[in-house]
């Protein structure tokens, strides 16, 4: 039952994580103007991994594409890999744990194959998760770097009347929430793992004895049989389930309302 | 058709108050931003406030803060615009002014409404 | 705050002549983000409030005759009426839009000659 749960929950967590990610990569804020010096701007600027956007006081959004590949720093183009590839782990990795999932039957699909496919899952979790960690963090230090290297430079031709001020760029939303959707990913990857070790069968050595009618010797036959690991193979062994010893029949013969044939 | 009209307007001693109003026709008015911009008589003009559509936020010139505060009523399709402790300088004829959807502008201007500060 | 230099202060143009207005701000009003000056021109004919001719620097409100055209970028800019009508006598302001509060400029004095 703890397995489920964990490994139930890990899915959801992972899930929401994975969303998380996918917003985060849409979302047009991950940086956004700095109001400190002007917290009056009538004009306010923020931008995205694909483009950058205006709101004017009205409420009229502008926004423009980067509709240049060659022409963007590499550290955006780095960034851009990073969530793409977070993405597409979280999606394979939610994809083979919904098969995984301890609730839901395919077939005679055994608990060892199970185990592997929620491992692989978990792992695949773990990876997207650290892979939006470590987009947005790329990301927010270009942001540091930019944001003291353009203070530096905040007011240029100060000699003269005119002054150009220079719009500095800070957190955005999508930053945070790429932090949060990653960190979650990551947990739910690892409560996968977790759940894992609870499905796998254990390697259990079960000792054959002899019984001699006429000496009075025991002869003992070390590794009998391992726990079979295969594909419907063996679907009569004895098994360790959660503490309580049932055979494959009987497993079968009680069919769920989670049970998909 | 658009319109704006400005009322409350007259005369008033320093030190007074006063309170303007502005009644908005023939648009959306909770769709838009709207300003109180003045007219020195002969002279310039001279932006006074602004406040957006959901009355959130609110902007004025330092000239008049703390003594004048903009508001609006949406459902009574009203721009307010209250003055206290009000100085000669304040004379002016006071416009309200729609703001534009696009550049921040004003695209619609009322006919105005005169205020006099004078003992 | 920014602060916005009309020059000249009065002009006399002919029936039909060219006008040139110049405005200049004490700070850019070229938005990086989208690449648009936030400045606008206003005209104010005698004893009328004053109405909206040209914003983000060149783009005309609608049913502003084309005569009229706005250039200039970050920190000049000029109004420009490419052909005198007797209508067009009025004091034409500037007006930055980039960051509250938004100041205008002293205002031009367009008369014919």
């Known amino acids: 039952m703890a397995v489920t749960a964990c490994q139930g929950l890990g899915f959801v967590v992972s899930l929401i994580g994975i969303a998380g990610i996918i917003a985060a990569t849409c979302m047009d804020q991950w940086s956004t103007q700095d109001l400190y010096n002007n917290p009056v701007t009538a004009v306010f600027n923020y931008q995205g991994l694909w483009r950058s956007c205006v709101r004017e006081s009205s409420g009229f959004t502008e926004c423009r594409g980067y509709f240049t590949l060659l022409g963007l720093p590499a550290m955006l183009q780095a960034v851009r890999a990073l969530m793409i590839v977070g993405i597409v782990l979280g999606a394979i990795g939610l994809l083979v744990s919904i098969f995984a999932l301890k609730c839901i039957r395919i077939g005679s699909m055994e608990d060892s194959a199970k185990a592997n496919m929620t491992l692989t899952s978990g792992i695949m979790f773990i990876v997207s998760g650290l892979c939006a960690i470590a987009g947005v963090s790329v990301f927010a230090n270009m942001l540091v770097t930019n944001f003291w290297m353009s203070t530096a430079n905040m007011y240029t031709g100060m000699g003269g009347m005119v002054q150009t001020v220079q719009t500095r760029y800070t957190f955005g939303a999508a930053l945070f929430v790429g932090w949060v959707a990653g960190g979650l990913t990551l947990i739910g990857g690892v409560m996968m793992c977790i759940a894992c070790r609870g499905l796998a069968p254990e390697e259990t050595n079960y000792k054959a004895v002899s019984y001699h009618a006429s000496g009075h010797s025991v002869a003992y036959k070390p590794g009998g049989f391992k726990a079979s690991t295969g594909f419907g193979s063996n679907t009569k062994n004895k098994k360790i389930y959660d503490g309580g010893a049932r055979t494959e029949d009987e497993v079968q013969s009680y069919p769920s309302k989670h049970d998909y044939v | 058709e658009v319109q704006l009209l400005e009322s409350g307007g007259g005369l008033v001693q320093p030190g007074g108050s006063l309170r303007l109003s502005c009644a908005a026709s023939?648009?959306?008015?909770?769709?838009?931003?709207m300003h109180w911009v003045r007219q020195a008589p002969g002279k310039g003009l001279e932006w006074v406030a602004y406040?957006?559509?959901?009355?959130?936020?609110?902007y004025s010139t330092d000239t008049v803060k703390g003594r004048f505060t903009i508001s609006r009523d949406n459902s009574k399709n009203t721009l307010y615009l209250q003055m206290n402790s009000l100085r000669a300088e304040d004379t002016a004829v006071y416009y309200c002014?729609?703001?534009?959807?696009?550049?921040?502008?004003?695209?619609?201007w009322g006919q105005g409404t005169l205020v006099t500060v004078s003992s | 705050d920014i602060v916005m230099t009309q020059s000249p202060d009065s002009l006399a143009v002919s029936l039909g002549e060219r006008a040139t207005i110049n405005c200049k701000s004490s700070?850019?009003?070229?938005?990086?983000?989208?690449?648009?000056?936030?400045l606008t021109w206003y005209q104010q004919k005698p004893g009328q409030p004053p109405k909206l001719l040209i914003y983000?620097?060149?783009t005309r409100e609608s049913g502003v005759p084309d005569r009229f055209s706005g250039s200039g970028s970050g920190t000049d800019f000029t109004l420009t009426i490419s052909s005198l009508q007797a209508e067009d006598v009025a004091v034409y302001y500037c007006?930055?839009?980039?960051?509250?509060?938004?100041?205008f400029g002293g205002g031009t004095k367009l008369e014919i000659k």
């Open positions: 700070q850019s009003l070229l938005n990086s983000g989208n690449q648009r000056n936030y």
């Open positions: 023939g648009f959306t008015f909770s769709d838009y931003g």
């Open positions: 983000w620097a060149s």
């Open positions: 406040i957006s559509r959901g009355r959130s936020t609110t």
């Open positions: 002014a729609r703001g534009s959807y696009y550049g921040n502008a004003m695209d619609y």
């Open positions: 007006q930055s839009a980039y960051s509250y509060p938004f100041t």
